[in-house]
């Protein structure tokens, strides 16, 4: 990718997914009735015409929002602190790296629209998640539903990153 998002960024993303999986505290089978349609903006991560700025912006905003969501008093009360600390550290590292990349991509003249538009969409999506948690009084099941939702959206975003990486490889080898 622009600053050549290295292999270790993909590794960090997968590590975040592993941590989110390990954070599970109750059986999701107990929480079926708490499911909610958060309307993850799939169109943002499914396109075939992927711009570097767009991909980085989506990843950056996703990680920033996940960091914020899991960096609250409510979150600290809900999750294992050791795993939560590891999650914070991993997200912080990824965010630092993405910020460096985004500066470089903007310096290369990629459209600012490709950066601001996904950010706004994702903020709305995460706001819906926050409203849901409040509505459900931050219950164990509500957090479990949110944990699964974040895993799904992060998985889709990481896939988008992998697609761009393989597109770059194809261009490089042709």
């Amino acid at each position: 990718l622009g600053c050549d998002l290295p292999q270790n960024h993909g590794l960090l993303s997968r590590n975040t997914l592993v941590l989110l999986h390990q954070m599970r505290r109750i059986s999701p089978f107990l929480c079926l009735k708490d499911r909610r349609d958060f309307r993850f903006p799939q169109e943002m991560v499914k396109g075939s015409q992927l711009q570097k700025a767009h991909v980085m912006s989506v990843l950056h905003e996703m990680l920033q929002q996940i960091f914020s969501l899991f960096h609250t008093e409510r979150s600290s009360a809900a999750w294992n602190m050791t795993l939560l600390d590891q999650l914070h550290t991993g997200l912080h590292q990824q965010l630092q790296h993405l910020e460096t990349c985004l500066l470089q991509v903007v310096g290369e003249g990629e459209s600012a629209g490709a950066i601001s538009s996904p950010a706004l969409t994702l903020r709305r999506y995460f706001q819906g998640i926050r409203v849901y948690l409040k509505e459900k009084k931050y219950s164990d099941c509500a957090w479990e539903v949110v944990r699964m939702e974040i895993m799904k959206s992060l998985f889709l975003s990481t896939n988008m990153q992998e697609r761009l990486r393989s597109k770059d490889r194809d261009l490089g080898s042709s």
């Epitope: 059986s27 958060f38 699964m148």
Partner: antibody, heavy 121, light 107 residues
Framework: EVQLVQSGAEVKKPGESLKISCKGS????????IGWVRQMPGKGLEWMGI????????RYSPSFQGQVTISADKSISTAYLQWSSLKASDTAMYYC??????????????WGQGTLVTVSS | DIQMTQSPSSLSASVGDRVTITCRAS??????LNWYQQKPGKAPKLLIY???SLQSGVPSRFSGSGSGTDFTLTISSLQPEDFATYYC?????????FGQGTKVEIK
């Protein structure tokens, strides 16, 4: 293309053991739960139980608790349904189907083709 | 356990007819209700999920409605390939339960 492929038909005697399988492909196997459904000859659908292949957490219908065991091997994207001692009343078609777990997506959107189990002396 | 009761248990209809099948839950299940179609010797096929969402690839003549305890599956204009058995199923809570089925036969 998402597929759930089940093992072939089985003919067994009462008291014998059996393990049938359901192999998932074309999707992230650990992102969905796998449910098992029984259909006795000429009858309706009965939910038996469900497994989360990511960590093998399992829940059974009270009617099937202790009668069958559901398991999964995520390394080969396969779920299993097994009996330690079959009865004639276990004669039925058994289906596996995938479930999105807590994610907002269609329930049981893909089904295996079914495994016919016949138990007769 | 949540009991699911379908009615009628069978019905005879002609091609082009409007067909309605109802499903009642023994307690409120919000909109966690799915409808399946099953043809002899085949696996069930998902038609409607979350009470009213049409599954991808399913013809628009199928529709679902309802919430709470009372639900309906409607086939607006019955086609020859629609003669089958239809099941409702709740996924509001475990154990997951199915209705007993409604067989739609040719008049």
């Amino acid at each position: 293309e998402v597929q759930l492929v089940q093992s072939g038909a089985e003919v067994k005697k009462p008291g014998e053991s059996l393990k049938i399988s359901c192999k998932g492909s074309g999707y992230s196997f650990t992102s969905y739960w796998i449910g098992w459904v029984r259909q006795m000859p000429g009858k309706g659908l009965e939910w038996m139980g469900i497994i989360d292949p990511s960590d093998s957490d399992t829940r059974y219908s009270p009617s099937f608790q202790g009668q069958v065991t559901i398991s999964a091997d995520k390394s080969i994207s396969t779920a299993y349904l097994q009996w330690s001692s079959l009865k004639a009343s276990d004669t039925a078609m058994y289906y596996c189907a995938r479930h999105p777990g807590l994610n907002w997506a269609p329930d049981f959107d893909y089904w295996g083709q079914g495994t016919l189990v016949t138990v007769s002396s | 356990d949540i009991q699911m009761t379908q009615s009628p248990s069978s019905l005879s209809a002609s091609v082009g007819d409007r067909v309605t099948i109802t499903c009642r839950a023994s307690q409120s299940i919000s909109s966690f209700l799915n409808w399946y179609q099953q043809k002899p010797g085949k696996a069930p096929k998902l038609l409607i999920y979350y009470a009213s969402s049409l599954q991808s690839g399913v013809p628009s003549r199928f529709s679902g409605s309802g919430s709470g305890t009372d639900f309906t599956l409607t086939i607006s204009s019955l086609q020859p390939e629609d003669f089958a058995t239809y099941y409702c199923q709740q996924s509001y809570d475990l154990p997951i339960t199915f209705g007993q089925g409604t067989k739609v036969e040719i008049k």
